[in-house]
């Protein structure tokens, strides 16, 4: 039950995180004009990964896409790549984790397969979260560097009559959304990995004992008794008839009402 809860919660947290990463990637406010000593501005600039926008005092907002690919800074391209990789990995992770959920039964999928899928999706979520955090952090670092450079420029060469005041940019809302979303995806991934440990079958090293009867040759392989004793309902007990010509599951694990959280 705790395993199902951990897995389910990991999935939900990752889902929210990936939705946040997608939202952050699409948002226009990665960097916003620094209003330092003037809280109200006639022209407010803000920029995203895909376009830059200007909001005028009337409320009119105009956005222009970055229609060049080669002319963009390498750092911006790197951030774009990291965010897209994060989204793709997260989306694949979500797809895998849906089939890995313990509360969803698909045919006669073994729990060991579900465990592997849970681990795979967990790792994907972790990498996805790290990509998002890395992307946002790279962009934030770029902003900090540019901020201090433009601040230095503002206070140099002011001897002349005409001043060219550079627009300084500071952290936009998308950065905080990205950091939080990346963190959630990472946490979700860790939870999936933890859930995987609980799902994985624990093999016991009992020696198989053969009982020879006069008429039939039936081999009993102990290990399935864990199911009845409650030590691990995931292990299958195989009875081998006629030299293993046909197998059937003796113990089926049905979800109990407590598994639905």
């Amino acid at each position: 039950m705790a395993v199902t809860a951990c897995q389910g919660l990991g999935f939900v947290v990752s889902l929210i995180g990936i939705a946040g990463i997608i939202a952050a990637t699409c948002m226009d406010q990665w960097s916003t004009q620094d209003l330092y000593n003037n809280p109200v501005t006639a022209v407010f600039n803000y920029q995203g990964l895909w376009r830059s926008c200007v909001r005028e005092s009337s409320g009119f907002t105009e956005c222009r896409g970055y229609f060049t690919l080669l002319g963009l800074p390498a750092m911006l391209q790197a951030v774009r790549a990291l965010m897209i990789v994060g989204i793709v990995l997260g989306a694949i992770g979500l797809l895998v984790s849906i089939f890995a959920l313990k509360c969803i039964r698909i045919g006669s999928m073994e729990d060991s397969a579900k465990a592997n899928m849970t681990l795979t999706s967990g790792i994907m979520f972790i990498v996805s979260g790290l990509c998002a955090i890395a992307g946002v952090s790279v962009f934030a670092n770029m902003l900090v560097t540019n901020f201090w450079m433009s601040t230095a420029n503002m206070y140099t060469g002011m001897g002349g009559m005409v001043q060219t005041v550079q627009t300084r940019y500071t952290f936009g809302a998308a950065l905080f959304v990205g950091w939080v979303a990346g963190g959630l995806t990472l946490i979700g991934g860790v939870m999936m990995c933890i859930a995987c440990r609980g799902l994985a079958p624990e093999e016991t090293n009992y020696k198989a004992v053969s009982y020879h009867a006069s008429g039939h040759s039936v081999a009993y392989k102990p290990g399935g008794f864990k199911a009845s004793t409650g030590f691990g309902s995931n292990t299958k007990n195989k009875k081998i008839y006629d030299g293993g010509a046909r197998t059937e599951d003796e113990v089926q694990s049905y979800p109990s009402k407590h598994d639905y959280v």
């Epitope: 004009q33 022209v43 200007v54 105009e62 005041v165």
Partner: antibody
Amino acid sequence: QVQLVQSGAEVKKPGASVKVSCKASGYTFTDYLMLWVRQAPGQGLEWMGNINPYYGRTYYALKFQGRVTMTVDRSTSTVYMELSSLRSEDTAVYYCARDGYSLRNAMDYWGQGTLVTVSS
Amino acid sequence: DIVMTQSPYSLAVSLGERATINCKSSQSLFNSGNQKNYLAWYQQKPGQPPKLLIYGASTRESGVPDRFTGSGSGTDFTLTISSLQAEDVAVYYCQNAHSYPYTFGQGTKVEIK
């Protein structure tokens, strides 16, 4: 058509207050910022501040802060500008003007002006 | 505050001749975000409120005759009346529309020679 109609001329004594109104018609009143600009006799134009009729948010020029109050009455599509502690140098024609949407912060329509004379 | 300086103070031009008014700002009115200049030109005739002629330094307001042309970028701007008409006699103002507080030039009076 867009019209901004202002209240009539006022004569005030120094230290008094004046309240000028500006009634808008011909457009969606809450969609456009309203600005106040004054012009002393024979002088140039001076921006005093603006008001967002939708939120009622105001922004005043530093020179007038503490003395000017801009308010809005959405039910009558009217904005008001009140200037207190009047001095002789406040004698001017006061204009309300609309900030034209998508016009790079330019003022596309103006009221006819209200002459405020401050004299003892 | 951005200081707007217009020149000349007054201008006398013959009918049909070209009139040129200059406006210089103490700070750039160019916005890199959208590559636009935030400068407006107004015409004010005696006893009337100002009338918008040009916004964004070069875009003519609807209904304004095409003899009025705005040009310039950054800190230096020009309003040109290609062929002066009798009804163009007025005072012309440039306005900083980039930063609060909005500021105006002192005005240029255009008369007929």
